[in-house]
């Protein structure tokens, strides 16, 4: 910790039920969301002249789940630099020593809305395919670093009015256990792949299932597999897609297999019926072709058996998506994760506190020495914007949405105030 840190650098402001003690450069804090990890505020960065999201992690070392997630998020946000993954602009703690250490503040790009709000808009094929393309680029970039998300959902994907998209978080740690028979905790499972729900092994295309669910929701305007718990989630999947083959059943653990095999047998519904023509945009003949391509992509992503499901690379080359293909985006060099043990780390709480503190200090040291870039490569709001000029901070603060935090509350936005104005 640098000796230069002093109280005069910070000020405190009450936000909902929490006190934000932030660097004075961040002004006009307005709450925009809250979730499992903490509260998020929109703010104006007076140094960069841009609007940002400030996320407070309160006592991130309070338990193993919080600690592991906070540490993992810090490490990955530092390493990952891709236009479809949210950028970390700053990290700080107002506490002066490790003994006093309580809170971490993450400053990130601020976007206009999350996908929950876009779902209620009627998107044309151009916008929809571009959003999906960006999702796939971001996912592919994470995969190239060995990060398999497993928990993609609309609330963790954010967009700007120019149709640009970013993934907010890094999903479930590799060590996070998911068990079909486990207690139904309050989390959104609608987008989790069968292999996650059923506690099977998984590979990269586990994330393709989630993209398929999100795409289906963008098309239909509602959640496509809305289960009340893991078991009901599985029921909703098989009711629509049909009971999987015996070949798939063999891959299940005995107890899960026993349950799954004893469910009623469903033949499944044809994709032409699940996603009929009339729910797609149909302004022109070209739209009809695009509708058929979109449905084909859905049918290849929403496949229960991961061994038969399309891969990320195949999805990027699918006719519906490939029109946007740019090697600089889809084949960006993989990030170098400096902590080789990141996914396997297990520690005493005291050790987590020290590790997280070191990460924060490392950032502060690097930024003090000018190593950390001042301006994001793809800033959320143009750097010459002021709060009055920017639509983001004004529009977003009035929405019940969450820009930089995993949230399980789906919020809607009237299509007339839609966050997607233009496309690339």
């Amino acid at each position: 910790m640098s000796d230069s840190k002093c109280d005069s650098q910070f000020y405190s402001v009450q936000v909902a039920d929490s006190t934000f003690t932030v660097l004075k450069r961040y002004q006009q804090l307005k709450p925009i969301g809250s979730g499992a990890q903490g509260i998020v505020c929109a703010a104006f960065d007076t140094v960069l002249g841009i609007n940002v999201a400030v996320k407070k992690l309160s006592r991130p070392f309070q338990n193993q789940t919080h600690a592991k997630r906070a540490y993992r998020e810090l490490v990955l946000l530092k390493c990952v630099n891709h236009k479809n993954i949210i950028s970390l602009l700053n990290v700080f703690t107002p506490q002066k020593t490790l003994e006093e250490f309580q809170d971490v503040y993450l400053v990130m790009e601020l976007m206009d809305a999350n996908l929950c709000q876009v779902i209620h808009m009627e998107l044309d094929h151009e916008r929809m395919s571009y959003l999906l393309y960006q999702m796939l680029c971001g996912i592919k970039h994470l995969h190239s670093a060995g990060i398999i998300h497993r928990d993609l959902k609309p609330s963790n994907i954010v967009v700007k009015s120019d149709c640009t998209l970013k993934i907010l978080d890094f999903g479930l740690a590799r060590t996070a256990c998911t068990n079909f028979m486990m207690t139904p905790y309050v989390v959104t499972r609608y987008y989790r792949a069968p292999e996650v729900i059923l506690g099977m092994g998984y590979k990269e295309n586990v994330d393709i299932w989630s993209v398929g669910c999100i795409m289906g929701e963008l098309v239909k305007g509602c959640v496509i597999f809305q289960g009340t718990d893991h078991i009901d989630q599985w029921n909703k999947v098989i009711e629509q897609l049909g009971t999987p083959s015996a070949e798939f059943m063999k891959k299940l653990q005995p107890t899960v297999r026993n349950y799954v095999e004893n469910r009623p047998k469903y033949p499944g519904i044809k994709f032409e019926e699940l996603f009929p023509d009339w729910i797609f945009p149909s302004e022109s003949e070209r739209d009809k072709i695009k509708t058929s391509q979109a449905r084909d992509l859905l049918s290849k992503m929403l496949v229960i058996d991961p061994d038969k499901r399309i891969s990320v690379d195949e999805a990027l080359r699918h006719p519906y998506i490939t029109v946007w293909y740019d090697p600089a985006e889809a084949e960006a060099p993989p990030p170098q994760i400096y902590d080789a043990q990141l996914e396997e780390r297990e520690h005493a709480i005291e050790e987590w506190k020290e590790l997280i503190y070191k990460e924060v200090m490392d950032w502060e040291e690097r930024s003090k020495n000018g190593v950390v870039k001042d301006q994001p490569s793809d800033a959320a709001v143009s750097s010459n914007a002021t709060p009055s000029q920017s639509s983001s901070i004004n529009d977003i603060s009035s929405m019940s949405t969450e820009q930089t935090l995993a949230s399980d509350t789906d919020s809607s936005l009237d299509a007339s105030t839609g966050p997607l104005e233009g496309c690339r």
Partner: antibody, heavy 119, light 107 residues
């Protein structure tokens, strides 16, 4: 061979102080988080305090907070527990235990040192 | 604080028996659950960590299962040296807490 050897226990009057030590050998002491766990006569185990590998981060059970201080000297491979304002209910065998690397569990324990608080 | 409740508090069994001890946490602790064995006058010994992983050197007749709030320690075929007191312990958050113990006695 991993060894943890506690010392410093004994009879002390209520309100008195005592400093326990735990000498570690057979492993890289500075790489491991450590803890103190106690056991009152005929009772179960109670975690007392923990400390990170570098010693910067500590935590305590509510029952000892403000009275006990955990510390370590990595150059001496030694863990300490400074116990002040001792009470009769602090009477116990005090064990020093190492947190494993693979998982946060106490994988090695010392043989314990008895602290008796009585007038 | 997370409370750990073990049952039964004592148990009589014979050599060769299959024995099960349960431990319940007052809130979800994922798989941050460890089991220890303690014999009179001795320090505790780690048997199972992470709910189901067998500590090196511990006989395979010991096994653990569970996640969330409910956990089980099973001894498949009781041996004379297994008569002792067993404790569960959570390392999910501080203060780390132990169950009150289960004393396993010879019938």
């Amino acid at each position: 061979e991993v060894q943890l050897l506690e010392s410093g226990g004994g009879l002390v009057q209520p309100g008195g102080s005592l400093r326990l030590s735990c000498a570690a050998s057979g492993f890289t002491f500075s790489s491991y988080a450590m803890s103190w766990v106690r056991q009152a006569p005929g009772k179960g185990l109670e975690w007392v305090s923990g400390i990170s590998s570098y010693g910067g981060s500590t935590s305590y059970a509510d029952s000892v907070k403000g009275r006990f201080t955990i510390s370590r000297d990595n150059s001496k491979n030694t863990l300490y527990l400074q116990m002040n304002s001792l009470r009769a209910e602090d009477t116990a065998v005090y064990y020093c235990a190492r947190f494993g690397h693979a998982f946060p569990a106490f994988d090695y324990w010392g043989q314990g040192t008895l602290v008796t608080v009585s007038s | 604080d997370i409370q750990m409740t073990q049952s039964p508090s004592s148990l009589s069994a014979s050599v060769g028996d299959r024995v099960t001890i349960t431990c319940r946490a007052s809130q979800s602790i994922s798989s941050y659950l460890n089991w220890y064995q303690q014999k009179p006058g001795k320090a505790p010994k780690l048997l199972i960590y992470a709910a189901s992983s067998l500590q090196s050197g511990v006989p395979s007749r010991f096994s653990g299962s569970g996640s969330g709030t409910d956990f089980t320690l099973t001894i498949s075929s009781l041996q004379p040296e297994d008569f002792a007191t067993y404790y569960c312990q959570q390392s999910y958050s501080t203060p780390y807490t132990f169950g009150q113990g289960t004393k396993l006695e010879i019938k």
